[in-house]
């Protein structure tokens, strides 16, 4: 898939919603200039495309939601890359511009006659994209044309700024919340000295900045902070990992505010360099409970603690998705390519990928094999429903007593739609309330996951806790089989009684050497020894001074025993 020809998925309707999904992986470093995307993705790509198509079917068949109005869509591939997503967003805008000019009778043929050509309907709003960096670029464009955007996984804190991103909303919380959750986990296990890694780009940078700020306030020191692109080469990951080893054995915990593919890059480097088991990775929701991150590198990932946005599986999606077959699913233009990639086989009569696979796809193949639902499926569906409810409320207010699109909604005014969307609240697909605060953000609820070896060569994520609006709950016995197994990640051990901490010049406050106080000194505070005043002596616990009792000599007392310097 290169920049010359982009495939689009269409579904007709009275109102068209745009969507950007990462149907393919981002371009590798050497292919960035061509905007040539990587391999097709199932969870982040195909499943989300199918979720959009099927959710719209459900909305359209719901008599209580947008009655007499059919929602359609135009789905484009963002490839998890800003340049590709921008190019695709321009296509959305171009359609909208042509449509609005046509509404105003501005479309004319070169000879001056009016055009009978009907262009595509304008996009009223956009769902996605997944990545924060990409979402920011897309928002910068969409807001110029008053097109609301609802994200399902772009969690960067920057996007809360409505002065910059007025038309942006999301059904997920801002990363400020999960940064807090990560700090709370670090605090819980008394890890005071940790290394930090983040994915280059907005998600990782702003998230790590928040993590560092909050850590500093809690007395947690960062041994060193590193950044890397998800599509960086092996050498870059090897280099980063070697740098992390230079902080061992003290900084064993690595806090990673990272996209999933950054974590995978780290795991692969651990395998190459022989560093499995040296670190405990604490990962943000870019990792969550994704198997595409750990597949083939489970040994390296064992012990990892991750943050996952609370979102149970959507059963009705699986009921629909698992029945899909390449010979009947023609509305998803990427489905045949995906099928071949998923099963490593060749579909008869499908030219695109033929050279890659030798064997022909068996007719008994089914998506039920090794099926894992996208962990953010609930959010994708909630984002689509948010758009539908926003349009529904707008229709009720602009077209009272009218079923369908009245003139007041032709064309749809993006400003009014945004207003309506911000006021939207409804019960989400998992039974939770979906609502937006003044920044267009949703409340924060997270699950804490732990990647464990469950049996011989069998690994899985297990839920070991939750973080809900500032409260961390953890099942410590599930994470650590016994107290002594809790990993230590500290720079210096506490000083013994009668010792003070001496922080070396240029060192962080968590690294010190312990120095004993002098014989006549007591520990004034953890960094200072103070001499006792004349006539007093340090107490046994060296926390203060006691007066030395004065003993008077009386006649008849034996002479004090003393030795002269000359006595040998």
């Amino acid at each position: 898939q290169s920049s010359e020809r982009r495939v689009v998925a269409h579904m007709p309707g009275d109102i068209i919603i745009g969507a950007l999904f990462s149907v393919h992986h981002q371009p590798t470093v050497d292919k960035v200039h061509e905007r040539k995307c990587g391999a097709v993705r199932e969870q982040y790509g195909i499943q989300r495309v199918e979720a959009m198509l099927h959710t719209l079917e459900r909305i359209n068949s719901d008599p209580t939601l947008l009655p007499n109005i059919t929602l359609g869509c135009e789905i484009r591939d963002s490839c998890w890359h800003s340049a590709v997503a921008l190019e695709q967003s321009i296509e959305f805008i171009r359609d909208s511009l042509i449509s609005s000019e046509e509404e105003e009778g501005l479309v004319r043929c070169v000879d001056g006659s009016s055009s009978s050509f009907r262009s595509k309907k304008p996009i009223v709003g956009v769902i996605g994209p997944g990545s924060s960096s990409v979402a920011i670029q897309v928002q910068n464009l969409l807001q110029l044309f008053n097109i609301p955007q609802i994200a399902y996984s772009a969690t960067s804190m920057d996007l809360s700024d409505k002065t910059l991103f007025k038309y942006f909303m999301r059904v997920v919380p801002s990363d400020a919340q999960q940064a807090r959750a990560m700090v709370d986990i670090v605090k819980r296990y008394n890890w005071t000295y940790v290394s930090a890694v983040h994915t280059e780009g907005n998600y990782g940078e702003s998230g790590m900045e928040a993590f560092k700020d909050m850590s500093a306030k809690e007395g947690i020191c960062i041994a060193h902070s590193y950044k890397i692109y998800s599509n960086a080469g092996e050498q870059s990951f090897d280099k980063l990992l070697k740098k992390l080893t230079s902080h061992l054995p003290k900084a064993r915990v690595v806090a990673c505010f990272c996209e999933g593919m950054t974590v995978r890059g780290l795991l692969m480097a651990m395998r190459r360099l022989g560093l499995a088991g040296e670190f405990l990775l604490l990962g943000s929701d870019g990792w969550a409970d994704r198997y595409d991150v750990t597949d083939g590198y489970q040994r390296e990932a064992v012990g990892g603690i991750t943050i996952k946005l609370q979102s149970p599986d959507v059963k009705w999606f699986d009921d629909y998705y698992l029945k899909l077959r390449p010979e009947t699913n023609h509305r998803n233009p990427w489905f045949q390519e995906f099928w071949q990639h998923r099963f490593q086989c060749r579909l008869e009569g499908f030219p695109q990928e033929n050279s890659k696979y030798n064997k022909t796809c068996d007719s008994s193949l089914t998506l039920k094999t090794h099926h894992v639902q996208d962990s953010k499926m609930g959010f994708v569906i909630n984002a689509i429903y948010s758009m539908a409810y926003g349009l529904h409320n707008m229709q009720m207010s602009l077209c009272p007593g009218y079923a369908g699109l009245c003139d007041a909604m032709k064309p749809i005014d993006g400003r009014k739609l945004l207003e309506s969307l911000m006021k939207t609240n409804f019960t989400g697909v998992s039974g939770d309330m979906i609502l937006f605060d003044e920044n267009g953000d949703s409340p924060g609820r997270y699950e804490i996951m732990n990647f464990k070896e469950m049996g011989k060569d069998y690994f899985d994520y297990i839920n070991v806790g939750s973080w809900d609006n500032g409260e961390l709950k953890m099942d410590d016995d599930e994470v650590w089989s016994k107290k002594s197994n809790i990993i230590r990640s500290v720079c210096s051990e506490p000083c013994e009684k009668g010792q003070i901490k001496v922080i070396r010049k240029g060192e962080v406050s968590c690294c010190w050497t312990c120095t004993p106080c002098k014989e006549n000194e007591y520990v004034f505070d953890e960094y200072t020894c103070k001499a006792c005043q004349l006539g007093s002596w340090p107490t046994d616990d060296l926390t203060g001074c006691d007066l030395i009792p004065v003993q008077y000599l009386r006649w008849g007392d034996p002479e004090p025993d003393y030795k002269d310097d000359d006595d040998k």
């Epitope: 070697k242 395998r271 560093l275 040296e278």
Partner: antibody
Framework: QSLEESGGRLVTPGTPLTLTCTVS????????VGWVRQAPGKGLEYIGI?????NTWYASWVKGRFTISKTSTTVDLKMTSLTTEDTATYFC?????????????WGPGTLVTVSS | AYDMTQTPASVEVAVGGTVTIKCQAS??????LAWYQQKPGQPPKLLIY???DLASGVPSRFKGSGSGTEYTLTISGVQCDDAATYYC????????????FGGGTEVVVK
């Protein structure tokens, strides 16, 4: 700070043997220790390493014949299925850091002779 | 695997001369390379690490350079005491490796 190998001797093929590297002034919970051998007149050959964490890694040719373990002051190299090819001087060396890197402090070596 | 190939196997140099030893890795080791000097009956001694950093107490006539897969040890103003065998070692990876050391270069000083 020093390392010293011991346990090297003449053995017959197939006899198991354990070499011990005794360290002085080195905190084994902070440094990695590696084992390297050198056959008479030949070059250095890497055997394996034990990290500060206790994790071990071996050269691919070792294939389970050798095992490295440690206490707070010693690092052992347990050798099984010895053949005449294993005749060499065995060195233990302290790593530059907690994991694999460079060896900046070496023991004098201990000679192992495998002969029938 | 990160295999190390060292050339030449042996080199003769006059006192005061310059000797160059090369080491090639089968894949990039990103400057994680060390050079050792070994004299008969003694253990190896670390000379250079991270491709170009001099270990403490090592004379400045020893110089390391290179990056990626190609590395060089240069000894200028060679002295009699420099007669020894020199080994390179990749310090990057210990998983799936056969030998982390190069084959060695014997330096004979005339």
């Amino acid at each position: 700070q020093s390392l010293e190998e011991s346990g090297g001797r003449l053995v017959t093929p197939g006899t198991p043997l354990t070499l011990t590297c005794t360290v002085s002034g080195i905190d084994l919970s902070s440094y990695a220790v590696g084992w390297v051998r050198q056959a008479p007149g030949k070059g250095l050959e890497y055997i394996g390493i034990i990290y500060a964490s206790g994790n071990t890694w071996y050269a691919s040719w070792v294939k389970g014949r050798f095992t490295i373990s440690k206490t707070s002051t010693t690092v052992d190299l347990k050798m099984t299925s010895l053949t005449t090819e294993d005749t060499a001087t065995y060195f233990c060396a302290r790593g530059h850091g907690a994991t694999y890197d460079y060896f900046n402090l070496w023991g004098p070596g201990t000679l192992v002779t495998v002969s029938s | 695997a990160y295999d190390m190939t060292q050339t030449p196997a042996s080199v003769e140099v006059a006192v005061g001369g310059t000797v160059t030893i090369k080491c090639q890795a089968s894949q990039s080791i990103s400057s994680w390379l060390a050079w050792y000097q070994q004299k008969p009956g003694q253990p190896p001694k670390l000379l250079i690490y991270d491709a170009s950093d001099l270990a403490s107490g090592v004379p400045s006539r020893f110089k390391g350079s290179g990056s990626g897969t190609e590395y060089t040890l240069t000894i200028s103003g060679v002295q009699c005491d420099d007669a020894a065998t020199y080994y390179c070692q990749q310090g990057l990876a210990t998983a799936n490796v056969d030998n982390v050391f190069g084959g060695g270069t014997e330096v004979v000083v005339k």
